[in-house]
């Protein structure tokens, strides 16, 4: 590691981002006192002035929501935290260059699994993000990642699974046995930026055959 840190008041200042919700987090160092307070500033790449984040000045919690301030997903941002403790000088630490497009992780999709007698339908609901379009509406993940697709698996038993993938939001696994339990998993993938969500899983039972 190329930085020697002996301040002990403040550590690990970083963005944690999922679905473009960008939260600045940090840890108190070993020398941190109970009266330590934190103030947050942020700026865009290449800008000279740091901007104070309202609501995150002289706070005691170790996180600050900067989603609105870092809403442009094509922009690079920095944030910094200044820790102040009685009887000591302030300590400031800044994040690495942050791009939500590059750094955000994708949460599992929101899916409705609908059992039928010989099939299971899976409906993927669009995922809204805080990212705004030029005309001010919230963009979905699909609108941000044009290469986004869904990978669906249906575990029939321990040795056999059915697979579907595509960009559409409605899928149906056909030719299933009635009155049988299946485990479905649906994952979001964006190949260009190598992102993959954790799977949404649903356990569903096909309906009994009443005929």
């Amino acid at each position: 590691h190329t930085t020697e840190d002996t301040s002990g008041l403040l550590r690990h200042v970083k963005f944690q981002s999922s679905n473009f919700e960008n939260i600045l987090t940090w840890d108190a160092g070993p020398a941190s006192a109970p009266d330590t307070v934190y103030s947050v500033e942020y700026k865009k790449y290449g800008e000279k002035e740091w901007l104070a984040k309202a609501g995150c000045q002289r706070i005691t919690q170790k996180f600050c929501n900067l989603t609105v301030e870092t809403r442009n997903h094509t922009e690079f941002y920095y944030a910094k935290v200044t820790a102040v403790s009685s009887g000591g000088p302030p300590v400031t630490k800044m994040t690495d260059r942050f791009s939500s497009l590059q750094h955000t992780t994708i949460r599992p999709p929101d899916v409705t699994c609908i059992p039928k007698v010989r099939s299971i339908q899976m409906l993927v609901h669009p995922t809204l993000t805080p990212v705004l379009s030029e005309d001010g509406h919230q963009l979905t993940l699909e609108e941000i990642f044009h290469d986004l697709f869904y990978r669906l698996k249906l575990h029939v038993n321990h040795t056999y699974q059915m697979n579907l993938e595509g960009k559409q939001r409605e899928y149906e696994f056909l030719g299933l046995t009635p009155d049988t339990e299946f485990l479905g998993s649906i994952t979001i993938l964006t190949p260009i930026l190598s992102k993959e969500s954790a799977p949404y899983t649903c356990r569903v039972k096909t309906l009994p055959d009443r005929t």
């Epitope: 790449y45 400031t92 630490k93 260059r97």
Partner: antibody, heavy 116, light 113 residues
């Protein structure tokens, strides 16, 4: 007032090593990126690399990767440039310069001469 | 790497006259997120470090006289000294910060005619 002061330059033999220092004052070194830029005698400016002094994350000009290492000691408010396997063509004035894109404050520079 | 090419290499201008330095980049420096150009200009006097004059292609650094102005977009940029003063004798460099590695032009020497 922001000030950057380089030191550690001098005469070194080819193949030798040298560590340059950049002492920052007037601000906390962890509050802005730090860069190293060099200028050969009578020549132009060449960016070596940058460090985020808070995290230690570095980015180098590929030309210098492997031979040159940038580091920081936060407690001393000082950045360093470790230079190994020096060659005659590394003879230059070495500057530290602050900021993450363009460079708003520069040190006065320290001269490194590589010669046998 | 983005190559920055300045012209001319040197320039002799009479006191009070306009000096114009050009800088051309090998690819566009227009930063799509803010529609600004990632170009800076520096002044370097003999025995001194460079001094930042202009950033974002046209924003003047605090304390820089208003006779210095920057213009241009994409790949073609200009630094203009509207009325050359004796203290403006120096070498001027452009620098791109669009992508790593950051690169500089070769410099333009401005002298008094």
């Amino acid at each position: 007032e922001v000030q950057l002061v380089e030191s550690g330059g001098g005469l070194v033999q080819p193949g030798g090593s040298l560590r340059l220092s950049c002492a920052a004052s007037g601000y906390s070194i962890t509050a802005e990126y730090m860069n190293w830029v060099r200028q050969a005698p009578g020549k132009g400016l060449e960016w070596i690399g940058e460090i985020n002094p808070s995290t230690g994350t570095t980015t180098y000009n590929q030309k210098f990767k492997g031979r040159f290492t940038i580091s920081v000691d936060q407690s001393k408010n000082t950045a360093y440039l470790q230079m190994n396997s020096l060659r005659a063509e590394d003879t230059a004035v070495y500057y530290c310069a602050r900021f993450d894109a363009y460079f708003d404050y520069w040190g006065q520079g320290t001269l490194v001469t590589v010669s046998s | 790497d983005i190559v920055m090419t300045q012209s001319p290499d040197s320039l002799a201008v009479s006191l009070g006259e306009r000096a114009t330095i050009n800088c051309k980049s090998s690819q566009s420096l227009l930063y799509s997120s803010n529609q600004k150009n990632t170009l800076a200009w520096y002044q370097q006097k003999p025995g001194q470090p460079p001094k930042l004059l202009i950033y974002w292609a046209s924003s003047r650094e605090s304390g820089v006289p208003d006779r210095f102005s920057g213009s241009g977009s994409g790949t073609d940029f200009t630094l203009t000294i509207s009325s050359l003063q004796a203290e403006d004798v120096a070498v001027y460099y452009c620098q791109q910060y669009y992508s790593y590695p950051f690169t500089f032009g070769q410099g333009t020497k401005v002298e008094i005619k």
